[in-house]
């Protein structure tokens, strides 16, 4: 890391060190001789998140309901706004700037993790055992059902997608 | 009251590394910046550097670049300076010095030294 | 980096006498500008900063003046405890700068 001719929170002007604006406010004008820097506190819809000499506070990100986002957490004049998505659907990239709908999980398939408003659904698919009838985005793979328990016999083994089948056992001997 | 303790004298081989510790008492460690300033025999003060106890953040001089690490341990209150690959004309008295806590700075980097450590001689000799 | 050159390297004076050093900075520096006292095998002592500033506990005999380029440190009346050397050193940008020293010798 190379040298660097002021302290932290300094910034180096005209051959001194300026002391940087704290998060929340913007630079107005550099310290001289004889006066600190001047700062002033960023507006209601802005933010600066840093320690700074930014001349403009940045604007406030904005949720919006058309794309579906909706605000998680209202911005100060420290913090950027924090979208998330509306209930049923969730954000296209880190940054949240769009929503998509939660996707299903098909027949064969049942959910693993169901969807936040920043993840999608994960499916799984069904194992030995287990089978999912039906495309969802809350259903887990369900268990076949255990014949015997019911005093009955596997007429038609199951798959991933179809329960087991059972029926009467046969009471005929050969 | 304030005290800056230093550890003891150290005779090192060139090539090899020495590592000096600070040990800082009287004051709230993380609230002031720690200097290194080295005086070779007979000459006069050079600073090497700083480090920011809080933040860890740290600062060399351009001519001990990639040689110098200077760390702390806060929960000691200790500050280390530790020197690598030396040589003949690094045999000098090091010290640590402390930042005057000054009330008044609307410019510039206000480093001035209140408080020094005793200093460690470091003898660089084959 | 800023230089700093003191003169003279070293002054020969009796106990009383009024004893000035010059520091010249190699770029304007402000009034960022401190003075030390340095003891044989001691550590420099503050003495001035701020260019004019005395430290808490220095003596009112030794004060400082000068901003931009120009600084004096000035011993009004020489005491037996002032033999040492001086060292003045810039605190605007880092790195930080020492001059090379004046020596206050006995005469």
């Known amino acids: 890391e190379p040298p660097t001719a002021c302290r932290e929170k300094q910034y180096l002007i005209n051959s001194q060190c300026c002391s940087l604006c704290q998060p929340g406010q913007k630079l107005v004008s550099d310290c001289t001789e004889f006066t600190e820097t001047e700062c002033l506190p960023c507006s209601e819809s802005e933010f600066l998140d840093t320690w700074n000499r930014e001349t403009r506070c940045h604007q406030h990100k904005y949720c919006d309901p058309n794309l579906g986002l909706q605000v998680q957490q209202k911005g100060t004049s420290e913090t950027d706004t924090i979208c998330t998505c509306e209930e049923g659907l969730h954000c296209t990239s880190e940054s949240c700037e769009s929503c998509v709908p939660h996707r299903s999980c098909l027949p064969g398939f049942g959910v693993k993790q169901i969807a936040t408003g920043v993840s999608d659904t994960i499916c799984e698919p069904c194992p030995v055992g287990f089978f999912s009838n039906v495309s969802s985005a809350f259903e887990k793979c369900r268990p076949w059902t255990s014949c015997e328990t019911k005093d009955l016999v596997v007429q038609q083994a199951g798959t991933n997608k179809t329960d087991v089948v059972c029926g009467p056992q046969d009471r005929q001997r050969a | 009251q304030v005290q800056l303790v230093q550890s003891g004298a150290e005779v090192k081989k060139p090539g090899a590394s020495v590592k000096v510790s600070c040990k800082a008492s009287?004051?709230?460690?993380?609230?002031?910046?720690m200097h290194w300033v080295r005086q070779a025999p007979g000459q006069g003060l050079e600073w090497m550097g700083w480090i920011n106890p809080d933040s860890g953040g740290t600062n060399y001089a351009q001519k001990f670049q990639g040689r110098v690490t200077m760390t702390r341990d806060t929960s000691i209150a200790t500050a280390y300076m530790e020197l690598n690959r030396l040589r003949s004309d690094d045999t000098a008295v090091y010290y640590c010095?402390?930042?005057?806590?000054?009330?008044?700075?609307?410019?510039?980097?206000?480093?001035?030294?209140?408080?020094w450590g005793q200093g460690t001689l470091v003898t660089v000799s084959s | 980096d800023i230089q700093m050159t003191q003169s003279p390297s070293s002054v020969s004076a009796s106990v009383g006498d009024r004893v000035t050093i010059t520091c010249r900075a190699s770029?304007?520096?402000?009034?960022?500008l401190a003075w030390y006292q340095q003891k044989p095998g001691k550590a420099p002592n503050l003495l001035i900063y701020?260019?004019?500033t005395l430290q808490s506990g220095v003596p009112s005999r030794f004060s400082g003046s000068g901003s931009g380029t120009d600084f004096t440190l000035t011993i009004s009346s020489l005491q037996p405890e002032d033999f040492a050397t001086y060292y003045c050193q810039q605190a605007n940008i880092f790195p930080l700068t020492f001059g090379g020293g004046t020596k206050v010798e006995i005469k």
């Open positions: 701020t260019a004019s």
């Open positions: 009287g004051y709230t460690f993380t609230g002031k910046y």
């Open positions: 770029q304007g520096i402000y009034s960022w």
């Open positions: 010095a402390r930042d005057q806590p000054l009330g008044y700075c609307t410019n510039g980097v206000c480093s001035y030294f209140d408080y």
